[in-house]
């Protein structure tokens, strides 16, 4: 192979300019001509200066793994994919998200630590003595002593899911 | 041998517009970018644009409307063309082949009365 | 546009030592290119494509990164290696430098 400048790329025993980002190779340089370039079609891309016949394929962003587009993907560049809402990143593939998982709902009896974000999932923690969630989504559990006013006395202790009325 | 060679008037006066010519051998026109480049004195780089193999051209958005890149093949020169310049467009100008392989030594320009 | 911004501004270092920069992308970037600029001199092609060597680039220099977030390494800091150096990305019009990252020798 022939030593190419870094703007160049090999063919056969010569050198020939590469094409810019956006564009691939439609026709090797000659003795008097020059590389002839044709933009990248689109859903596909380049994104450096190259001696490819042909473009990449567009990466897509799949909704059943909890996928959205975060970039749209450009002739110079790839889509970039995110986490749907709701979801988190399971699986990181350089700066960008390869797969996604929905947020961990809460159990009845636990509050909401921390909700999630586009990288962590949800943190749920059991609600204190004394204090109940019944649906898991409060942030901050009920205390569940207080009786309904038309009940004179507890019927019984509760848990931290329910409270007795 | 790849050589680049800017030449310019040194010295412009504000209001008025810049010329440069980037005279290149050991390549072809027709089948490499050429960028133009500038750099005010003790400053960083900035990209000003671009003219392609195939003569499409690329601009830095924040200058387009003062600047015009055109180039003729035969003659192995590249031309920038920058209006209404001002002291702020002081600077060493650069022309450099596709992403920076070969660059010519520059060309100060002073924009002063 | 994309910013690029280049840290630290001013750094030195001794001969023999390791020598990291950074170049941080607002948004990202497929690839980075680097430069080295000498006073009085033109800029110099060191890495292109985020890690390829620039012919005659001694092997001291490397370059990794993805995404927003880009590095230059000097494995072994020599005095020839003082410079300022510029990182560029040619992913998105307009093609943008980064500020530098001046290099002294201690």
């Known amino acids: 192979l022939p030593s190419c400048k870094e703007d160049e790329y090999p063919v056969g025993s010569e050198c020939c300019p590469k094409c810019g980002p956006g564009f691939h190779v439609r026709q090797a340089c000659g003795e008097q001509t020059g590389t002839v370039c044709e933009p990248c079609s689109p859903g596909t891309y380049i994104a450096h200066f190259n001696g490819l016949s042909k473009c990449l394929q567009c990466q897509m962003c799949d909704p059943a793994m909890g996928l959205r587009t975060s970039r749209n993907c450009s002739t110079t560049a790839n889509a970039l994919c995110g986490c749907s809402p709701g979801h988190f990143c399971i699986i990181q593939d350089g700066d960008h998200c390869a797969a996604c998982r929905a947020y961990a709902t809460s159990s009845p009896g636990q509050r909401v630590q921390k909700g999630g974000t586009e990288s962590q999932d949800t943190l749920c923690q059991n609600c204190p003595p004394g204090t109940f969630s019944s649906n898991g989504t409060l942030e901050e559990c009920q205390h569940g002593t207080k009786c309904s006013k038309w009940l004179v006395t507890e019927a019984g202790p509760g848990t931290s899911s329910f409270r007795w009325v | 041998q790849v050589q680049l060679k800017e030449s310019g008037p040194g010295l412009v006066a504000p209001s008025q517009s810049l010329s440069i010519t980037c005279t290149v051998s050991g390549f072809s026109l027709t089948g490499y970018g050429v960028n133009w480049v500038r750099q005010p004195p003790g400053k960083g780089l900035e990209w000003l644009g671009m003219?392609?193999?195939?003569?499409?051209?690329d601009y830095n958005s924040a200058l387009k409307s003062r600047l015009s890149i055109s180039k003729d093949n035969s003659k192995s020169q590249v031309f920038l063309k920058m209006n209404s310049l001002q002291t702020d467009d002081t600077a060493r100008y650069y022309c450099a082949r596709s992403y920076g392989s070969y660059w010519g030594q520059g060309t100060l320009v002073t924009v002063s009365a | 546009q994309i910013v690029l911004t280049q840290s630290p501004a001013i750094m030195s270092a001794s001969p023999g030592e390791k020598v990291t920069m950074t170049c941080s992308a607002s948004s990202s970037v497929s690839y980075m290119y680097w430069y080295q600029q000498k006073p009085g001199s033109s800029p110099r092609l060191l890495i292109y494509?985020?890690?390829n060597l620039a012919s005659g680039v001694p092997v001291r220099f490397s370059g990794s990164g993805s995404g927003t977030s880009y590095s230059l390494t000097i494995s072994r800091m020599e005095a020839e290696d003082a410079a300022t150096y510029y990182c560029q990305q040619w992913s998105s019009y307009p093609f943008t430098f980064g500020s530098g990252t001046k290099l002294e020798i201690k």
């Open positions: 494509d985020t890690s």
């Open positions: 003219i392609w193999g195939d003569g499409n051209t």
